[in-house]
Interface confidence: low
């Protein structure tokens, strides 16, 4: 049952497993929420009646029943994690916290003209967790305008107190701010030979990627494979850290693989879901339960079911015993992880699914699409949006794409001339236009926030959001795609995509189908030298054949170029300009979505 | 229903001048970005010029800089192309469209049909 009120004045008593530090009762249940094992909490208030050492305490607990004894105590909150709910997740803390100082290791101070300043420090410096600001009001003259970078083991405060004139906050690396490097390779045959913070057992190299990526104290990672010579040490994820934040040395060691943290990039690539099974493998841990299952697929279910349940294995029937069904062994330890893996006993493992939420919904693998034709077929761009305007007659604007349960992201210069969202409908779910009918549901436009340095589309900030009156739920046919990250800025995209309902050719009409094209992106220099008219900037991206023939024309404004990269589709482009329709030589331009990260989360996220 | 009506084309000798209109009607023009597009005998349509609704902010072909001014009034809904030292690549019929962006605004019955203009001695 998922319980996401906090409880005023109420001690959960029993079942703790840890204790930390926390600024306010809402983040440390988002510290329960992460924690593998915690289901429920109490966090203590500063109050008059509490003794101040115990002040911001957030005491993490577990409970096999999923719920402990209530007493009443005055200054406790207590609540429940929210791994039993099944709404999205997040771990982006933007709060400031005014006269807190949050301790930890100071082990980068400078001066900063803002506390923003200094968050933003903290938010591009690798090690950074937290911070504290001393403001200009400070008493101390020497440490006004000083900003402390701090990081712990756990990656919360060791201690809280009360200090004037301080202000502390959060790294907002988790808020997919940050501009540190996004590095998603995996080196083959090599060791990083740095110090291990901690080591876990993990079934592959990308499972032991993700562990580091939500482990606080995570940089990067060497993984031990199954073939690893010293058996002891197969399936062995080693996590670890460096002053510099990057490997010092290097070691070429056949049957190991390596890695980095991908916490720049975790807004675009799952980090927390391990989604695959592993064949003839046994994941060892403690047992929740031992149910009959029909596949390692229902296996999963049950897991995913079962909020206590971490990871399983499932052991297939023998022939004709028990109606088909195999045993499912729900188990659980207290990192999430398996306390040791076997190979060759023929089980069938995998984790639960339960952690999905944690990761952006855009990360979800959609079906595969058809290659080949210009037509699409449903469900095979499932962000894509037909923005019509109903003013004087309805008809089809523009495109955009779903970006949050309630957030289109689109051209700004589809807004020419339109007056008042009022007159806005969005359609999602869409692929013929002709499905349109008087009956048929839509998406209100609360608010349309148009970037305020647009002008004109070819010089650039070319870039809207649409609030929804009403949010959407999520469906195979409408869900969102992901913002690419900041610290992918350098990688090259082959598979790149551009879709719409418009024109065919510049004098035509708007397609019933949505229609798509595989088009190469162009470098900037490139599309330079084809708009010498024009200055092609950073925060434009251009795509098109030499030749022409394929290209986004009237009507696809405002509509996405999706690029597929590791499996997850990215919104690299929005449809804005270009010289004609298909042109040699005459690239589409369309808006660099990667250089307006900022504002776009700035708008969809403010309070 | 949007309308658009080219005038002022024709025949004119190289380094002379011409003045080109637009009449729109149909739609709130003064919030519409428009521009001069051509179309030359056997090539593409070519972007020449066009002006921003909000600041009347003007960008031109690398071709035609410097000799062809765009204007507009939008009391009188009307877009201008005032075109000088003309040369005889500057041939080509003339259409008043929306920017260059790719939103629909005008259906494919809202472009106007054109007006010719011939640069020869």
């Known amino acids: 049952e998922c319980v996401t009120q906090l409880l005023k004045d109420t001690c959960f008593e029993g079942g703790d497993i840890t204790t930390v530090f926390t600024p306010s009762a809402k983040y440390c249940q988002v510290v329960c929420t992460y924690h593998p094992r915690c289901l429920l909490f109490t966090f203590t208030a500063e109050s008059p009646s509490e003794d101040p050492t115990r002040w911001f305490t957030c005491v993490l607990k577990d409970s096999v029943t999923e719920t402990l004894p209530r007493v009443n105590r005055t200054a406790a909150i207590s609540g429940y994690s929210f791994k039993q709910c099944s709404h999205q997740i997040s771990a982006c803390n933007k709060d400031i916290y005014v006269d807190l100082d949050m301790k930890g290791i100071n082990y980068n101070s400078s001066v900063a003209k803002s506390a923003q300043e200094c968050q933003e420090r903290c938010t591009d410096d690798v090690h950074c967790h937290f911070f504290t600001y001393a403001t200009r009001q400070f008493p101390s003259l020497e440490h006004r305008n000083i900003c402390l970078l701090k990081h712990t083991q756990t990656g919360t405060p060791t201690r809280i107190t009360k200090l004037d004139k301080v202000v502390s906050g959060f790294s907002l690396k988790s808020c997919a701010l940050s501009n540190l490097a996004c590095i998603r390779d995996i080196f083959p045959n090599t060791v990083f030979a740095d110090s291990n913070i901690d080591s876990v057992m993990a079934p592959d190299a990308f499972v032991c990627g993700r562990i580091c990526t939500h482990h606080p104290g995570c940089l990067f990672f060497t993984f031990f494979s199954q073939e690893w010579p010293k058996e002891s040490q197969r399936n062995l994820c080693l996590l670890k850290t460096s002053e510099s934040g990057l490997p010092s040395t290097r070691i070429k060691k056949s049957k190991a693989l390596s890695g980095f943290s991908l916490q720049s990039c975790r807004h675009s690539i799952p980090v927390f879901c391990h989604s695959s099974f592993y064949h003839d493998t046994d994941f060892l841990g403690e047992e929740l339960d031992i149910v009959a299952a029909k596949s390692h697929e229902a296996c999963q279910k049950l897991c995913t079911n079962a909020v206590r349940c971490q990871f399983f294995t499932y052991t297939p029937a023998q022939a004709s015993c028990n109606e088909g069904k195999g045993k499912c062994y729900l188990k659980l330890s207290s990192n999430g992880s398996p306390t040791k893996i076997l190979h060759g006993r023929g089980g069938i493992s995998g984790y639960t699914l339960r952690l999905c939420k944690m990761d952006n919904e855009c990360t979800t693998k959609i079906k595969p699409r058809i290659v080949g034709g210009t037509a699409s077929v449903r469900g095979e761009w499932p962000w894509q949006v037909t923005l019509h305007t109903t003013s004087p007659t309805q008809r089809h604007l523009c495109g955009g794409s779903i970006i949050g349960n309630q957030w289109i992201l689109t051209a700004a210069h589809c807004f020419y001339g339109v007056e008042s969202p009022k007159i806005l409908r969005v359609y999602s779910g869409i692929l013929n236009q002709s499905e349109i009918k008087e009956d048929t549901s839509f998406f209100g436009v609360q608010e349309i926030i148009i970037h305020d340095q647009y002008k004109m589309a070819e010089s650039g900030y070319d870039i809207a959001l649409l609030k929804l009156e009403t949010t959407v739920n999520y469906t195979d046919s409408q869900r969102p795609i992901c913002l690419p990250s900041k610290g992918d800025r350098n990688v090259i995209y082959t598979d790149c995509w551009v879709t719409g309902w418009g024109y065919r050719k510049l004098r035509d009409k708007i397609q019933n189908t949505l229609q798509k094209a595989k088009i190469p992106l162009v470098t900037n220099e490139e599309c330079q030298k084809r708009y010498r008219g024009h200055k092609i900037t950073h925060k434009m991206i251009c795509a098109g054949y030499r030749e022409g023939g394929k290209d986004a024309c009237k009507g696809d404004s405002g509509g996405p170029l999706s690029c597929k990269h590791n499996e997850v589709w990215h919104l690299v482009g929005i449809t804005s300009w270009g010289e004609g329709c298909a042109q040699r030589e005459r690239p589409g331009v369309y808006t660099n979505v990667v250089e307006y990260v900022d504002w776009i989360l700035e708008k969809t996220q403010a309070v | 229903q949007v309308q658009l009506q080219e005038s002022g084309g024709g025949l004119v000798q190289p380094g002379g001048s011409l003045r080109l209109s637009c009449a729109a009607s149909?739609?709130?023009?003064?919030?519409?970005?428009m521009s001069w597009v051509r179309q030359a005998p056997g090539k593409g349509l070519e972007g020449v010029s066009g002006?921003?609704?909000?600041?009347?902010?003007?960008y031109y072909a690398d071709s035609v800089k410097g000799r062809f001014t765009i204007s507009r009034d939008n009391a009188k809904n009307t877009l201008y192309l005032q075109m000088n030292s003309l040369k005889t690549e500057d041939t080509a019929v003339y259409y008043c469209?929306?920017?260059?962006?790719?939103?629909?605004?005008?259906?494919?019955?809202?472009w106007g049909q054109g007006t010719q203009v011939t640069v020869s001695s």
């Open positions: 469209a929306t920017g260059r962006t790719r939103e629909t605004y005008f259906r494919e019955d809202d």
């Open positions: 149909g739609l709130t023009f003064s919030l519409y970005d």
């Open positions: 002006i921003n609704s909000g600041d009347g902010s003007t």
